[in-house]
């Protein structure tokens, strides 16, 4: 097991998850850790505890390893970090990777006020309701601005969007969370259509899919609840 020393001089590795950082309960996920070609061992930590290790075969000069989680559950959802060793030295810790498990317990209802088809500039609010008491709700937009919002609430939360622009159009879903990394099933999708304005188009995004695989977001919330942009499919944390 890695021992902290003053000589932690190697650069920190990069950590990411594929196919995504949001994993349906019972599904598998790969956590990749990229360090150096000279690395003799990689260690993966989960919530601060030693989780797994890999010693790359000398014949394969690869600078990354894959850790496989065969069945994602609420027990494996949380914050992961990795380290690597080269010679006698250990690297600094990677940035945290936040893995979320979805598909737990219940399915929320999502609706939009005043209606799903609105005029440019009209005020719009999304409502998310979950019968099971929860601590926080998340609203996600597919393929959109890469933003996710969260609101605290017991069984219902509202997400005021303000005067809408064309950037707001698209398909939304919401989740209730039992903790930051254990989420409900997704709601049914709600598509927001925007009409009016210079180019009168009420088209939603043309991509026909409503699969979670196409969502783009990052789970490091700021105080306002909005998130920084980050690719969903290939979620890499790196500074």
């Amino acid at each position: 097991q890695r021992i902290n020393t003053e000589k932690e001089t190697l650069p920190k590795p990069i950590i990411w998850a594929k196919p995504s950082i949001m994993v349906t309960n019972g599904n598998s996920v790969n956590i990749w850790c990229q360090g150096a070609q000279s690395a003799s061992e990689y260690q993966l930590y989960f919530e601060g505890s030693f989780f797994a290790l890999e010693r790359p075969k000398p014949s394969r000069s690869m600078n990354k390893v894959r850790f496989f989680i065969s069945q994602m559950t609420s027990h494996t959802a949380g914050i992961y970090t990795c380290f690597y060793q080269s010679g006698e030295l250990w690297s600094k810790s990677s940035n945290p990777l936040k893995l979320v498990v979805t598909g737990l317990y219940d399915t929320p209802n999502l609706w939009v006020y005043p209606r799903p088809e609105v005029t440019l500039g009209e005020n719009v609010t999304f409502f998310c309701q979950l019968k099971t008491a929860t601590s926080k709700f998340f609203l996600l937009k597919e393929r959109g601005s890469n933003h996710i919002q969260n609101k605290y609430g017991n069984i219902q939360a509202e997400f005021p969007m303000g005067p809408v622009t064309r950037a707001h159009r698209g398909t939304y879903r919401c989740f209730g969370s039992y903790n930051d990394y254990a989420w409900s099933f997704p709601s049914e999708p709600v598509t927001l259509l925007i009409t009016g304005g210079v180019e009168n188009s009420s088209l939603a995004p043309t991509d026909p899919t409503s699969s979670l695989d196409y969502w783009e977001f990052d789970l490091s919330t700021n105080e306002s609840g909005l998130q920084k942009d980050s690719a969903f499919w290939d979620h890499t944390t790196q500074n």
Partner: nanobody
């Protein structure tokens, strides 16, 4: 579905040896990473040793040099050879598997394992 059945537990004197076996059902054994955990009375389950599907091993500091984990893919069995046993080794020993797994992964955390045996009791006393 994978089933794990441990055997080989029993009572032994301090300094003695035992070999635990864990037989796995199914044809997925060669693609599984395996581990041994133990739980002493009134204590939490703790990691003992693990082996990757390519025979790379890792041990808890408390058993390093005394215990050896190995596997026989032809027999679908993983072993824990325990020697120089001490009173503090008294516990129920559990075999666990990660199925499937990838490459040379060795799993140390119990949350990683998706299949568990029922356990076998090892008692070390004079």
């Amino acid at each position: 579905e994978v089933q794990l059945v441990e055997s080989g537990g029993g009572e032994v004197q301090p300094g003695g040896s035992l070999r635990l076996s864990c037989a796995a059902s199914g044809r997925t054994f060669a693609s599984a990473a395996m581990g041994w955990f133990r739980q002493a009375p009134g204590k939490e389950r703790e990691f003992v040793a693990a082996i990757s599907r390519s025979d790379d091993t890792y041990y808890a500091d408390s058993v390093k040099g005394r215990f050896t984990i190995s596997r026989d893919n032809a027999k679908n069995t993983v072993y824990l050879q325990m020697s120089s046993l001490r009173a503090e080794d008294t516990a129920v020993y559990y075999c666990a598997a990660v199925v499937p797994t990838y490459g040379n992964n060795i799993y140390v955390h119990s949350a990683a394992y998706n299949y568990w045996g029922q356990g076998t009791l090892v008692t070390v006393k004079p």
